[in-house]
């Protein structure tokens, strides 16, 4: 291909790409027509005054993963068609004023992954079409009032990964088209009443892995369009009654891995489009009534690793649409018949690492298409007859891990589980810890009268004695009390995600793999 | 239909105490908390606290916490409401009340008057 | 403790007349608040339920309304057997708490 230096490979689609730790300058010529440069992984160490002169036609520029720690100035002089620039992964400390001076095309603006310490007002300030800035993975401690004032037009803006501990309340004023703010893993302790008051628009505020203590009550009120906030791994403690009452169109809220103690009445809410709800890893002691009523559409509830002892009958009140329900890992030792009752689709309930002694005979009546119900590890030692009665689509029942007690009353549900044996997954089964001469037999083929003779026993069992049908769907079967899952959680829509190694037989959410991803 | 019937009245004197039963019927007695209320003469409502009869768990007002114990009797479908150290102020109406589709008392019991009199 | 204060204590009333009583929480109480009517000698009867949904058999001349802090229970219309005491009571914290009841009398 005509003009194409010999380090590179040019495409007829205008396109080049310089890769190889043997080039340690641009490479020239250039093709004149060159729409698309790439120059990665290789040894260039600084960018020199107008290397990319003969190719003004220059579209989209990608100087990643190089060695690149300076750049003159003048260095992107003559692009001024130029809409995507990327000088990520580099080793970047400063940015010249005026580098990206006549680049009056530019849309995308990828800086992330350097070692910037600091931006300033006149690094940006002729930038004014660009829609995507990128400044996570760099060192700033500070953004200066003033910094983003020209990019009236930004869409997404990253400074996620960085070392900030404040931020100005001015900073974002004019970013009123800004959709996409990401301020995750930085150090901020409080954000400033006011701080996202221009972001009308904003749809994605990322605040997770900070050490936020405190919100203001009206920070979001503002921030009509937001659909995901993320809140999680911070210090949060408190929530502020209204702090999100203007949020009618937010779809996913974390907030797991935080100090809450209690849920204020009516704080989630009014939120019609809310899907997830992230609160585990938390110290919520206890669930009043109606406490996620305002909740109509919410699909995932997460409530696991938190201390709740005690659920009101009415604390799932209006959750009609909910399909998950993670309780696991908590200190329940009781529930009240009712407190499911208004969960008509719930499909998979985690109660396992739990402290249940029994469950209400008629816990699950209203809940019929449950699929997968965890109680493993809690002090169960028989159920009510007829619990899963009516669950014709229960396809994962996990009860090993109980102290059954295996005497004459444990029959009818020794002869349920031997008829619905697959529910049970293969690779643990409940065993008897009482009688003593039982203890760490299958419950499953333990002869009930050689634990304790003769006691009559009713012929037919009052569990439902439903065959199990080798084609219902079935989720995988991956639990196991030794497993280490490295988890991401929840799944965010960019990669810059929470990895939390847990040792939990299942993952933070108590759900099979199936749905864990 | 949900039935609490409490035990009768009681006269007690001061320092004693008092042992108040409530036999439930017309559900599963041990599947929902069952909670105490009282009621002095010509007063105010005061709740005094729960117990789950499957387990026996309980949940007291600080009020009456050393003074107040909850317990279960699962053969019977009874629970009891005992208090001791017996005062004046505490001549008053009990009632035991199960809650229904969240913490608000839907049944009550009929009441039980303790008098507290030297 | 949350504090419910209700007013007024007492009221007199003729037939046919609108009724409103109010209940105010020391702190938000979301809706969990409940409405009860007591009659002498008798055991107080639920009339409404999260501030503002009717107990089953209740009458729809009784209304609740409120969340928060602010409650109010509304009888459009008194009849003769409405002639009772009203309490309220909150639910979303231990120890639940009552109002110290609002009486309505014959004018």
């Known amino acids: 291909y005509h003009g194409c230096p010999s380090e590179c490979t040019c495409s007829r689609a205008s396109q080049v790409e310089c890769t190889g730790a043997r080039i340690v300058a641009v490479p020239t010529p250039l093709p004149w027509n060159a729409m698309s440069l790439q120059i990665l992984n290789t040894h260039i160490t600084e960018l020199n005054e107008s290397p990319f002169l003969n190719i003004s036609a220059l579209i989209a520029l990608r100087i990643e993963k190089n060695e690149l720690s300076r750049i003159t100035p003048g260095a992107f002089r003559n692009l001024g068609s130029l809409r995507y620039l990327s000088l990520a992964n580099n080793k970047l400390q400063v940015l010249p004023i005026g580098l990206f001076q006549g680049l009056d095309s530019l849309e995308s603006l990828l800086l992330s992954s350097n070692q910037l310490l600091q931006i300033q007002p006149a690094h940006f300030s002729q930038c004014s079409n660009l829609k995507e800035l990128q400044l996570h993975g760099n060192h700033l401690e500070y953004i200066p009032d003033g910094a983003f004032d020209h990019l009236v037009g930004l869409t997404k803006l990253n400074l996620g990964k960085n070392s900030l501990t404040h931020i100005s309340p001015r900073v974002f004023q004019h970013l009123g088209n800004l959709q996409v703010l990401r301020l995750y893993e930085n150090r901020l302790t409080d954000i400033p009443m006011g701080t996202f008051d221009g972001l009308v628009n904003l749809q994605e505020l990322a605040l997770q892995q900070n050490q936020i203590g405190l919100l203001s009550p009206g920070l979001f009120h503002n921030n009509h369009n937001l659909q995901r906030l993320y809140l999680s791994n911070n210090h949060i403690s408190q929530l502020p009654p209204s702090v999100f009452m203007q949020l009618p169109q937010l779809n996913r809220l974390t907030l797991f891995g935080n100090s809450l103690k209690e849920l204020s009445p009516g704080i989630f809410g009014p939120m019609p489009n809310l899907r997830e709800l992230w609160l585990y890893d938390n110290h919520i002691s206890s669930l009043p009534d109606n406490v996620f009523s305002n909740l109509r559409q919410l699909q995932v509830l997460i409530l696991s690793r938190n201390q709740i002892s005690f659920i009101s009958p009415g604390a799932f009140n209006g959750l009609t649409e909910l399909r998950e329900l993670s309780l696991h890992t908590n200190a329940l030792q009781d529930l009240d018949g009712n407190v499911f009752r208004m969960l008509a689709n719930l499909q998979n309930i985690s109660l396992q690492n739990n402290r249940l002694r029994q469950l209400p005979g008629n816990i699950f009546a209203n809940v019929n298409g449950l699929m997968a119900i965890q109680l493993q590890n809690n002090q169960l030692e028989n159920l009510p007859l007829g619990i899963f009665d009516h669950l014709g689509k229960l396809c994962e029942l996990r009860l090993y891990d109980n102290p059954w007690r295996c005497d004459s009353d444990i029959l009818p549900l020794r002869n349920w589980l031997l008829l619905n044996q697959p529910r049970l997954g293969t690779d643990t089964v409940p065993v008897c810890f009482s009688p003593a001469n039982v203890r760490g037999q299958s419950l499953i083929i333990i002869n009930v009268n050689v634990a304790v003779p003769s006691v009559h026993v009713p012929e037919v069992p009052s569990y439902p004695e439903t065959p199990w049908y080798p084609d219902t769907p079935s989720y995988p079967d991956t639990t196991s009390v030794s497993s280490t899952t490295e988890l991401t959680s929840p799944v965010e829509d960019y990669t810059d995600l929470t990895t939390i190694q847990v040792t939990d037989d299942r993952s933070v959410w108590g759900m099979t793999q199936a749905q864990s991803g | 239909q949900v039935q609490l019937v409490q035990s009768g009245a009681e006269v007690k004197k001061p320092g004693a105490s008092v042992k108040v039963s409530c036999k439930a019927s017309?559900?599963?007695?041990?599947?929902?908390?069952i909670n105490w209320v009282r009621q002095a003469p010509g007063q105010g409502l005061e709740w005094m606290g729960w117990i789950y009869p499957g387990s026996g768990n309980t949940k007291y007002n600080e009020k009456f916490k050393g003074r107040v114990t909850m317990t279960r009797d699962t053969s019977t479908s009874t629970v009891y409401m005992e208090l001791s150290s017996l005062r004046s102020e505490d001549t008053a109406v009990y009632y035991c009340?199960?809650?229904?589709?969240?913490?608000?008392?839907?049944?009550w019991g009929q009441g039980t008057l303790v008098t507290v009199s030297s | 403790d949350i504090q419910m204060t209700q007013s007024p204590s007492s009221l007199s009333a003729s037939v046919g007349d609108r009724v409103t009583i109010t209940c105010k929480a020391s702190?938000?109480?979301?809706?969990?608040v409940a409405w009860y009517q007591q009659k002498p000698g008798k055991a107080p009867k639920l009339l409404i339920y999260?501030?503002?949904y009717r107990s089953s058999g209740v009458p729809s001349r009784f209304s609740g309304s409120g969340s928060g802090t602010d409650f109010t229970l509304t009888i459009s219309s008194l009849q003769p057997e409405d002639f009772a005491t009203y309490y309220c009571?909150?639910?979303?914290?231990?120890?639940?708490?009552f109002g110290g009841g609002t009486k309505v009398e014959i004018k």
């Open positions: 017309g559900y599963t007695f041990t599947d929902y908390y």
């Open positions: 009571q909150q639910y979303n914290s231990f120890p639940y708490t």
């Open positions: 702190q938000n109480v979301g809706i969990n």
């Open positions: 009340a199960r809650w229904g589709y969240g913490a608000y008392f839907t049944y």
């Open positions: 999260s501030a503002s």
